[in-house]
Interface confidence: medium
């Protein structure tokens, strides 16, 4: 690599013709160690480092901040307070670095942080008030715009005894702090069932990602308010399928569009009503990919092509008739 | 002309403390991260420990956590280590070394070293 | 921790001639940008002197007889000309994580 610093390159050290002329370094701001830094781009990476502290000599002009691939494991209360504030920064990610715990206030004293990435971090503690920063019940609300909590779940050993659906959702309703969040992503996470009043608290969504979870159905969930929302993942969970006032609901949404690839949807006679809405409907995509997966009789066939005919339930016998 | 000279080396009993310095000059001391460097007598280089400009982030070797303690006093110039309950594998000589604001660029001043020997 | 690893351990060279040194790190030290790869060399009785920096570039007041090279994992010290102030151990260091981790050593000596 060259030696010289360019306005768009990474630098982790001063500029070559700085540091053979003389023996100072430009100082402006300095690059913590283990890390690369461009003013120029307002960036700073420490990746894949180690890590198991955030460094606390970040430079006072960081915008975006990767610190990705470290072993962090516990993120404490303040963990980005500096004097003075790193007031720039606005994109954090923290994928990937072994995070267990985040615990009240971690995000404290960013007033610019739109965006922040915990995905693929055990997080077996998640505080309520690691995004509100206070137990108040109406916190000040939080700059974040987007907030990426894909693949957070933790072995299935290291959870606590409750819920993790719960302590995600708690952590996402505390103080309503997240009333201007627009992008939610929670993929991955083996979700069985979103509690119903998660979507109700978070009006500025536009693009909620629940992929790859296993979601059985959404009949106690409400879309109703989110009259922004722009885009809605539901691939690859474990739905059967999606009752009536699910889909109205649905397709009262402006701006819409529903992904439901890869779900279990069982074609029987509690079908008929999202048939007939599947073909009438433009909010889903790809919906000609979608198909039965059960009974075993359908498996495979498409749900566009089905009728009402094809959609039968086995009769429910008497129990003196019924077999084991 | 960039000067680092290491002091306060010397014998120590096995357990007992001795604390080394380092005087700066030459370089504006608070701009740069800190190091020490240790070498065995006949063996190799192993680094020891690292302290940012403004002492505000720490890193040890496991080999010396928890009794070796890195700290400096910008306002003398001096970089300074604590050493505790020290063993017989602790004996070496131990350098004191700049390294720039940015760390891309390794260790571009090193002291002459201090001998430390740990002995009953 | 990344495990420095230097070939060969010693290497007796005629003045004139060329000599290398290879480092091999225990996993990648290097980012898509740079590479965290550095070079010392140790006379008898004084401290290391840095020599290459981030893997090729040439510290100020070095001879330009020393070059260094590679990425990822793989790095080498040329010496083009061997001179005789040139012996002593030279020494690879990473600086990608804590610890900071130096190879072994290698013993240049004139023949």
């Known amino acids: 690599s060259s030696p010289t610093s360019s306005a768009s390159s990474f630098s982790s050290s001063a500029p070559f013709l700085a540091s053979a002329v003389s023996a100072q370094p430009p100082l402006p701001d300095q690059c913590p160690a283990l890390c690369e830094c461009s003013e120029a781009a307002r960036t700073v990476k420490c990746v894949n480092r180690n890590l198991t502290e955030v460094p606390t000599d970040l430079p006072a002009y960081v915008r975006n901040l990767f610190l990705t691939g470290n072993q962090l494991a516990v993120l404490p209360a303040g963990a980005f307070a500096r004097r003075p504030p790193l007031a720039e920064l606005a994109a954090l990610n923290l994928s990937g670095s072994r995070l267990d715990e985040v615990r009240a206030g971690a995000f404290e004293h960013l007033p610019s942080l739109r965006q922040l990435d915990l995905s693929h971090n055990p997080l077996a503690d998640l505080s309520p008030f690691a995004f509100s920063g206070s137990n108040a019940s109406v916190s000040a609300p939080s700059p974040l715009v987007e907030l990426i909590l894909n693949h957070i779940v933790p072995p299935e050993d290291e959870r606590q005894n409750r819920s993790f659906e719960g302590m995600v959702v708690a952590a996402l309703l505390a103080g309503r702090a997240l009333q201007g969040l627009r992008r939610l992503e929670l993929a991955s996470n083996h979700f069985l069932y979103l509690p119903r009043d998660v979507l109700a608290q978070l009006p500025s969504l536009r693009h909620l990602d629940l992929s790859n979870n296993s979601l059985v159905s959404l009949t106690y969930v409400s879309f109703r308010n989110l009259t922004h929302l722009e885009s809605l993942h539901l691939e690859d969970n474990a739905l059967k399928v999606l009752h009536n006032g699910t889909l109205a609901e649905l397709q009262g949404l402006p701006h819409i569009r529903v992904f439901l690839d890869n779900n279990p949807w069982v074609c029987d006679c509690h079908m008929a009503d999202m048939v007939t809405w599947l073909k009438e409907t433009e909010v889903v995509q790809g919906k000609d990919r979608l198909t039965c997966a059960y009974p075993e009789k359908m498996r495979n066939r498409v749900l566009l092509e089905l009728n009402s005919a094809d959609l039968d339930c086995d009769p429910i016998l008497p129990p003196s008739l019924q077999t084991s | 002309e960039v000067q680092l000279v290491e002091s306060g080396g010397g014998v120590v009993q096995p357990g007992r403390s001795l604390r080394l310095s380092c005087a700066a000059s030459?370089?504006?001391?608070?701009?740069?991260?800190m190091h020490w460097v240790r070498q065995a007598p006949g063996k190799g280089l192993e680094w020891v420990a690292y302290?940012?400009?403004?002492?505000?982030?720490?890193y040890y070797a496991d080999s010396v956590k928890g009794r070796f303690t890195i700290s400096r006093d910008n306002s003398k110039n001096t970089l300074y280590l604590q050493m505790n309950s020290l063993r017989a594998e602790d004996t070496a000589v131990y350098f004191c070394?700049?390294?720039?604001?940015?760390?891309?660029?390794?260790?571009?001043?090193w002291g002459q070293g201090t001998t430390v020997t740990v002995s009953s | 921790d990344i495990v420095m690893t230097q070939t060969p351990l010693s290497l007796s060279v005629t003045p004139g001639q060329p000599a290398s040194i290879s480092c091999r790190a225990s996993q990648s030290v290097s980012s898509s940008t740079f590479s965290y790869m550095h070079w010392y060399q140790q006379k008898p009785g004084q401290p290391p002197q840095l020599l290459i920096k981030?893997?090729?570039n040439l510290e100020s007041g070095v001879p330009d007889r020393f070059s260094g090279s590679g990425s990822g994992t793989d790095f080498t010290l040329k010496i083009s000309r061997v001179e005789a102030e040139d012996v002593g151990v030279y020494y690879c260091?990473?600086?990608?994580?804590?610890?900071?981790?130096f190879g072994g050593g290698t013993k240049v000596e004139i023949k």
């Open positions: 070394a700049r390294s720039p604001a940015y760390y891309r660029y390794g260790l571009d001043y």
């Open positions: 260091q990473h600086s990608w994580e804590i610890p900071y981790t």
């Open positions: 302290i940012s400009s403004g002492s505000s982030t720490f």
């Open positions: 981030s893997s090729s």
């Open positions: 030459g370089f504006t001391f608070s701009n740069f991260g």
